[in-house]
Interface confidence: low
């Protein structure tokens, strides 16, 4: 009598998540009498996938009618495949008895699930940094299979090279995650810059997924300060201007001090944007020279984005302004542009 063969023709089957997988199995003989069962895995811990006689297997259906006489095709179809369904499936013939006895197993079919990576999520630094500093951006994507994946970083269309990427777990898994960190050196022109994390995977059919982050959320461009004095007015008032230029973000507080005493505080708001994304702001102070006996030390103090104040001071020489005339003598600028390196 010819020995019974259990034939699983495919060594492996690859299916996209959400699709159906067909696992083929035929037997070479109708005898001995007994059922066919499908298992995932081998050995004592194997998982029963399909048993014609009993049990409820809502996602598994036989390909042909197993109740027909002379049926030798015991192939099954598993619907709505997820990465958790990956594994090796065995078609096993039993001899009828009490209990049924395992007679022969097929060679097994390895089911691998192609699952798409999630949309990459790019996160930037928790605190802003200034130009010439290096900041890190992180990109994460999850749930893909197989493990092979390509991740690239771009800044304004140019690929970044200071990148460290890990795919987890290192061993075999139903699905994988990728995490990559890119280090970017900021420049003062980066307010409008963007970093892009691009993920390419076999499931994406050549169209990579992209996640983006705007460097505007990571950069701080400290202001330049310049204090100038306009001509003396006929009423003995001097108009002093503090120009605060090329700063980002807009969050800025300006305080005028006369001889160390606070004269006025202003907050920047609704400023027009420069082409490079930075902002400019001009504040002015009218100083009544007649009201002062001695020289007046004026300080323009700027607090930008919660950072230590930047000052610019200079003196208005009262002696140079006789009270009875409207002189055009320029103020002596004794201040320095004190800049903090953050």
């Amino acid at each position: 009598e010819e020995e019974l063969q259990v034939i699983q023709p495919e060594k492996s089957v690859s299916v996209a998540a959400g699709d159906s997988a067909t696992l083929n199995c035929t037997v070479s003989s109708l005898i001995p009498v007994g059922p066919i069962q499908w298992f995932r895995g081998a050995g004592p811990g194997r998982e029963l996938i399909y048993n014609l006689k009993e049990g409820h297997f809502p996602r598994v259906t036989p390909v042909s009618d197993p109740t027909k006489r002379n049926n030798m095709d015991f192939s099954i179809r598993i619907s709505n495949i997820t990465p958790a369904d990956a594994g090796t499936y065995y078609c096993v013939k039993f001899r009828k008895g009490s209990p049924d006895v395992e007679l022969k197993s097929g060679a097994g079919t390895e089911l691998s699930v192609r699952a798409k990576p999630s949309a990459p999520v790019v996160s930037g630094p928790a605190v802003r940094a200034t130009a010439e500093h290096t900041v890190s951006f992180t990109c994460e994507s999850h749930g893909f299979s197989p493990r092979d994946i390509t991740l690239k970083w771009f800044k304004n269309g140019n690929e970044l090279s200071d990148v460290q990427t890990n795919v987890d777990p290192a061993g075999k898994s139903v699905s994988y995650s990728i995490r990559s960190t890119a280090r970017v050196v900021l420049t003062r022109r980066d307010v409008h810059s963007q970093v892009i994390c691009e993920v390419a995977h076999v499931t994406l059919q050549g169209d990579p997924l992209r996640g983006t982050a705007n460097l505007s959320e990571a950069i701080r461009v400290p202001p330049f300060l310049e204090v100038t004095q306009q001509s003396m007015r006929a009423d003995n008032q001097v108009n002093v201007t503090c120009q605060v230029t090329k700063f980002y973000p807009q969050r800025l507080q300006l305080t005028w001090l006369e001889n160390g005493n606070v004269s006025r505080t202003e907050m920047a708001s609704a400023l027009p944007e420069n082409k490079d994304g930075t902002y400019n702001w001009t504040s002015w102070l009218l100083v009544n020279v007649s009201a002062h006996r001695d020289d007046v030390k004026l300080t323009c103090q700027v607090e930008h984005d919660g950072q230590p104040a930047v000052n610019k001071s200079f003196s208005v020489k009262v002696s140079a302004h006789p009270k009875e005339q409207g002189s055009n003598t320029a103020a002596e600028n004794t201040g320095t542009n004190e800049r903090n390196i953050y």
Epitope: A17, G18, K116, S118, A119, V121, T203, L204, Q205, D207, L209
Partner: antibody, heavy 123, light 107 residues
Framework: QIQLVQSGSELKKPGASVKVSCKAS????????MNWVRQAPGQGLEWMGF????????TYAQGFKGRFVFSLDTSVSTAYLQISSLKAEDTAVYYC????????????????WGQGTLVTVSS | DIQMTQSPSSLSASVGDRVTITCRAS??????LAWYQQKPGKSPKALIF???YRYIGVPSRFSGSGSGTDFTLTISNLQPEDFATYYC?????????FGQGTKLEIK
């Protein structure tokens, strides 16, 4: 920057047809699926379906099969919604909205929206 | 179809308050949930995707949480520009469905 600009308001009589356009700029239209969302006056948002901008294949939600047609002209980066045999209950604002990509199973979240086109159907 | 139920339908709050809007799905949607803000006469604006991630440019006072069937949108330190209608949307299963909306009004 990325923008979806829709055609202007329309006043139509019952039984007529209307074609709403949605022009994409700032990105390649074929990289992202284009969805259509309806908002009746004073009501919430209702997803009508989407068009796969790479293949041109439309997918319609249950209540929008038949009189509603999604189409695409990639040469002018524009998606279209055509409604035929208009009824009074079609009066609504129609939005186009893009999702992260036709390659996602789920269609995704709508990251950019058009400004909306009001279609009024009245005799 | 998956039903999305938001609560409350409307609420009143003051500038500086912290408010929470909840969204419940009739079946598991994983983390495939987005939140949108809509002001009268304007198109919706995307705030949150994948239940917890803010879109670029969305202030950090907006935060999302939850997975499965129960989700929340929290707005801390409410600002005048935050008074609007908020919608949740699931994109786990076709058809994509929205909540009925929560109108946030100034007290």
């Amino acid at each position: 920057q990325i923008q979806l600009v829709q055609s202007g308001s329309e006043l139509k009589k019952p039984g007529a047809s209307v074609k709403v356009s949605c022009k994409a700029s700032g990105y390649s239209i074929t990289d992202y699926a284009m969805n259509w969302v309806r908002q009746a006056p004073g009501q919430g948002l209702e997803w009508m379906g989407f068009i796969n901008t790479y293949t041109g294949e439309p997918t319609y939600a249950q209540g929008f099969k038949g009189r509603f047609v999604f189409s695409l002209d990639t040469s002018v980066s524009t998606a279209y919604l055509q409604i035929s045999s208009l009824k009074a209950e079609d009066t609504a604002v129609y939005y186009c909205a893009r999702t992260r990509g036709y390659y996602d199973f789920d269609g995704g979240a709508f990251d950019y929206w058009g400004q909306g086109t009001l279609v009024t159907v009245s005799s | 179809d998956i039903q999305m139920t938001q609560s409350p339908s409307s609420l009143s709050a003051s500038v500086g308050d912290r408010v929470t809007i909840t969204c419940r799905a009739s079946q598991n949607v994983g983390t495939h949930l987005a939140w949108y803000q809509q002001k009268p006469g304007k198109s919706p604006k995307a705030l949150i995707f994948s239940a917890i991630y803010r879109y670029i440019g969305v202030p950090s006072r907006f935060s999302g949480s939850g997975s499965g069937t129960d989700f929340t949108l929290t707005i801390s330190n409410l600002q005048p520009e935050d008074f609007a209608t908020y919608y949740c949307q699931q994109y786990n299963t076709y058809p994509l469905t929205f909540g009925q909306g929560t109108k946030l009004e100034i007290k």
